[in-house]
């Protein structure tokens, strides 16, 4: 068989995956007492089941909805920070800021942070050579179809003040193709979510600009408008103060702008 | 079951065209990147054209860039490649695939000949 059929445009799987997902079970549901009755052997079967032996461009959310229902965690959903584009910065704010959450704070997000992996139609192998990629292949892969489900997930758990961490060195701010913008957004429940509030991150040392006024800030202040959701927007002008301030909140320097 | 109908082959002189169709059944067509390929007599397959499942992207071989052009229905379940400025290199059977699935149609034959 030439070698060509089974090559995908995206990196295969990332190696030693059964191994890291397991370890990351363990070590996760080690450190939150709230996941201890968690099974890792049951998960990591139940993972392994959503895309193993299935042709990777044909994965539904149902595939995964074993794996979600062992996953199954509850945050306080007043406390959810969503990002796009910018996941370092969310993920070093939660490590301070302990009482909010990303995606990537869950059981489900930690156990697929940054892993690549799919399978082969009819064999029960692991693909380590080569993954579908999401625009040159297809959409339907066991990665992208694992993110929209927990994302769809999280953001349907989402209350009150939700927040979301928006990268303001980008072309668009607001991507309305990222996940956040096609997925989170709109799952959002306006019977349950106040306001969106987003926080624009600047990139420059003396960018000074408001970027709460940029059109894709304006456009997702519209698509959340139209949910009946409110919606507000901060300039972060320096990301490193505002994650000291967060560190420090009684720093004299903190209670000017950041 | 999976099944795969090519078409549209046929005899053709140096410098002319054709379109080849191949439609697909017992799957969810728009799911699948597609690709075709091509046998020429005495010789292996090989690689001529790949799309993704939505149509968006699109691959060549470098023997046929900017001669071919491959496109896809997914209302229709259908693939096509569209063949301009034929050369008798091109002669051979032409199959079209589903990425990552064994099954194979019956092919169709492209004659380049005056």
């Known amino acids: 068989v030439p070698r060509w059929r089974q090559q995908w445009s995206g990196p295969g799987t990332t190696k030693r995956f059964p191994e890291t997902v397991l370890a990351r079970c363990v070590k996760y549901t080690e450190i939150h007492p709230e996941m201890r009755h968690v099974d890792c052997q049951s998960v990591w079967d139940a993972f392994k089941g959503a895309f193993i032996s299935k042709h990777p461009c044909n994965i539904t959310e149902e595939d995964y909805q074993p794996l979600m229902k062992l996953g199954t965690q509850t945050v306080p959903c007043n406390k959810i920070l969503l990002w796009s584009r910018i996941k370092d910065l969310a993920h070093q704010f939660t490590q301070v800021q302990r009482d909010m959450f990303t995606l990537e704070d869950t059981l489900l997000g930690y156990l697929a942070d940054d892993l690549t992996w799919c399978g082969e139609f009819n064999t029960s192998k692991i693909n380590y050579q080569s993954c579908p990629d999401w625009r040159k292949d297809c959409s339907n892969n066991p990665v992208s179809v694992f993110w929209k489900t927990v994302s769809r997930r999280f953001a349907e758990a989402a209350c009150d003040v939700v927040h979301v961490m928006l990268n303001g060195s980008r072309s668009k701010i607001f991507d309305k193709n990222s996940t956040f913008g096609s997925v989170e957004v709109h799952n959002l429940q306006p019977e349950k979510v106040q306001t969106l509030e987003a926080w624009v991150i600047h990139g420059g040392r003396e960018d000074s600009r408001d970027l709460c006024q940029d059109p894709t800030i304006k456009e997702l202040e519209s698509i959340i408008s139209k949910r009946n959701i409110q919606f507000s927007c901060k300039n972060i002008y320096r990301p490193d103060k505002f994650l000291q301030c967060v560190k420090n909140p009684e720093d004299s320097s903190c209670t000017s702008e950041i | 079951d999976v099944q795969l109908v090519e078409s549209g082959g046929g005899l053709v002189q140096p410098g002319g065209s054709l379109r080849l169709s191949c439609v697909a059944s017992g799957l969810t067509f728009s799911s699948y990147p597609m690709m075709w390929v091509r046998q020429a007599p005495g010789k292996g397959l090989e690689w001529v054209s790949r799309?993704?499942?939505?149509?968006?992207?699109?691959n060549y071989d470098d023997s046929v860039k900017g001669r071919f052009t491959i496109s896809r229905d997914n209302a229709k379940n259908t693939l096509y490649l569209q063949m301009n400025s034929l050369t008798p290199e091109d002669t051979a059977v032409y199959y079209c695939?589903?990425?990552?699935?064994?099954?194979t149609g019956q092919g169709t034959q492209v004659t380049v000949s005056s």
């Open positions: 695939r589903i990425l990552g699935l064994p099954t």
């Open positions: 799309i993704s499942d939505s149509g968006g992207y699109t």
